[in-house]
């Protein structure tokens, strides 16, 4: 979801303000409460799940949660698309779905989650720790990818939700912070609104800031699986074919995770019908790419009539994999 | 000019295989997949399966596992289909197509190759 | 597997004349349907993809339409060329399925 994080133009402080609550203090909630309300970001929940009838017969399930429209899911294994992963469905919710080995059968479950059934013989058949990515492009959030596997452990017909690779990484410690110091911030903004209630609000002047500039990209540990630590792309190394990466590296580059964390999940939007998708309780393992804003000089893929896609930080081909886009 | 070209005719006796080839020109062959079509005599068309020259990826009609085995060579730009355990079912007109994933259909076929099954 | 069902096997023409080819889907594929010409003796050429985007090169007497179940292919000012046998397909789901193809005959 694209938010722009306007801080409005102040009128001077009526006179009675001064002090106390002084021009710099005034600033400071406006920030914080644009940062606060702005924070949503999408995400995308992946579940695997080992058939009990056939043992070596998986079902992925992936499902975006976000209020934007989706252009294109790829699904991959052995880590994420562009990144050593090996692409096993490209669906697109007007123009059909291209699968393959051992893909048995992708749909679409919903208007934002699929599923895609994996058969199990044969040499380039899924075992217990393999991992799953799903990666979504859509409008106008960009490309966001999470990846699971069904932990060894797992008991067959049972729902095994992925849980987090045990790898923390460096970027990680930091967007932590910046979401400890945000949701500080957004505490220290409730107190001061609690503190000042009773004085007037004050007048706010059209901002002269442009509309269209972009606010930074953000990434955080959801709501929407609490309990969960979501680490991105930190799989878990499989013996499977095809090998996986012990560590798949976020494809945004290191300036895209320098920016804000947030805190608010987004439920799926559109009609009822599409919207009984069930989230998995704690097992998501969440991670997201954004490839939203194209760089300078940078042009978009031809996509035809009718498809959206945007700029991959990776270039042009990165959305399909290995179903080439020219 | 983007061209596919398949091999000539085959006639073949019940039981043994044929292989079908289809050489690309014109475009960068790793860049689209290569599909394959049955057309029987004065009969619709069927899709056998698909094939990613980039990684080998496959996927089969369930119809033709067993029957049909796609494989390409990169170094050649070509793409092979073989059918095996042939019976006169398989009498046919084979074509490869290739898959315009930017806008997924089939944009461009081959002409044929004419496979015919007989003792 | 989704059936793609052309109820009319022939359907004959004149020259200037406009015709509508239709095709049905048994379940719901979208806009995931393409259209397919085919003369005598020759392969198949694409003339419509995703229910109504013309092939390049494809003369504007050729439209497409439909989504869902139902999908239209229209030639207005019908052609001598014309001639040749029209086929749709489905890419909405895996294996794909072309219907049995429609046959126009110039009168």
């Known amino acids: 979801m694209r938010t722009e994080a306007q801080v409005p133009a102040l009128q001077p402080p009526e006179p009675g303000l001064e002090g106390a609550m002084g021009h710099r203090t005034l600033v400071l909630p406006w920030v914080l409460l644009t940062l606060c309300v702005t924070a949503g970001t999408p995400e995308v929940w992946v579940q695997v799940r080992m058939e009990a009838t056939e043992l070596s017969s998986f079902t992925i399930r992936c499902g975006f949660l976000g209020s934007g429209s989706i252009s294109l899911v790829t699904v991959s294994w052995g880590g994420p698309n562009g990144a050593g992963g090996t692409t096993l469905a490209v669906l697109h919710p007007e123009r059909g779905i291209r699968q393959w080995a051992p893909a048995r059968q992708a749909r679409w479950e919903t208007q934002s989650s699929i599923s895609l059934i994996l058969e199990g013989s044969g040499a380039s058949s899924p075992c217990a720790n393999t991992t799953f990515c799903c990666k979504f492009a859509s409008f106008p959030e960009g490309s966001w990818e999470a990846c699971g596997s069904l932990p060894p452990s797992s008991d067959p017909g049972l729902s095994a939700p992925p849980t987090p690779a045990p790898i923390l990484r460096a970027d990680l410690a930091g967007i932590l912070g910046v979401s400890g110091v945000l949701l500080f911030g957004c505490v220290y903004l409730l107190h001061l609104l609690r503190r000042h209630k009773h004085r007037p609000a004050p007048r706010l002047q059209p901002s002269r800031t442009s509309p269209q500039a972009p606010r930074a990209r953000a990434w955080a540990p959801s709501q929407a699986s609490q309990a969960a630590l979501h680490v991105p792309y930190a799989t878990i190394n499989t013996s499977c074919r095809p090998a996986t990466l012990d560590t798949a590296h976020p494809h945004g580059g290191p300036s895209w995770w320098a920016s804000l964390p947030t805190h608010a999940a987004h439920r799926p939007q559109g009609p009822a019908a599409w919207a009984s998708t069930p989230i998995p309780a704690r097992g998501s393992f969440v991670s997201v790419e954004n490839g939203l804003y194209a760089q300078a000089g940078e042009r978009p893929p031809h996509t035809g009539p009718g498809l959206t896609l945007f700029p991959d930080p990776r270039g042009p081909r990165a959305m399909e994999g290995p179903l080439g886009v020219r | 000019e983007v061209q596919l070209q398949q091999s000539g005719p085959e006639l073949a006796k019940p039981g043994s295989s044929v292989k079908i080839s289809c050489k690309a020109s014109?475009?960068?062959?790793?860049?689209?997949?290569i599909d394959w079509v049955k057309q029987s005599h004065g009969k619709s068309l069927e899709w056998i399966g698909a094939?990613?020259?980039?990684?080998?990826?496959?996927n089969y009609n369930q119809k033709f596992k067993g029957k049909a085995t796609l494989t390409v060579d990169k170094s050649s730009s070509t793409a092979y289909m073989e059918l095996r355990s042939l019976t006169s079912e398989d009498s046919a007109v084979y074509y490869c197509?290739?898959?315009?994933?930017?806008?997924?259909?089939?944009?461009?076929w081959a002409t044929g190759t004419t496979v015919t099954v007989s003792s | 597997d989704i059936v793609m069902t052309q109820s009319q096997k022939f359907m004959s023409t004149s020259v200037g004349d406009r015709v509508s080819i239709t095709c049905k889907a048994s379940?719901?594929?979208?806009?995931?349907v393409d259209w397919y010409q085919q003369k005598p003796g020759q392969s198949p050429k694409a003339l419509i993809f995703?229910?109504?985007n013309r092939h390049t090169g494809v003369p504007d007497r050729f439209t497409g339409s439909g989504s869902g179940t139902d999908f239209t292919l229209t030639i207005r000012n019908v052609q001598s060329e014309d001639l040749a046998d029209y086929f749709c397909?489905?890419?909405?789901?895996?294996?794909?399925?072309f219907g049995g193809g429609t046959k126009l005959e110039i009168r």
């Open positions: 197509t290739r898959w315009d994933s930017d806008d997924w259909y089939f944009d461009v």
């Open positions: 014109g475009y960068t062959f790793t860049d689209y997949n």
């Open positions: 094939i990613d020259p980039n990684n080998d990826s496959t």
């Open positions: 379940q719901n594929v979208r806009s995931a």
């Open positions: 995703s229910s109504s």
């Open positions: 397909l489905q890419h909405w789901n895996s294996p794909y399925t």
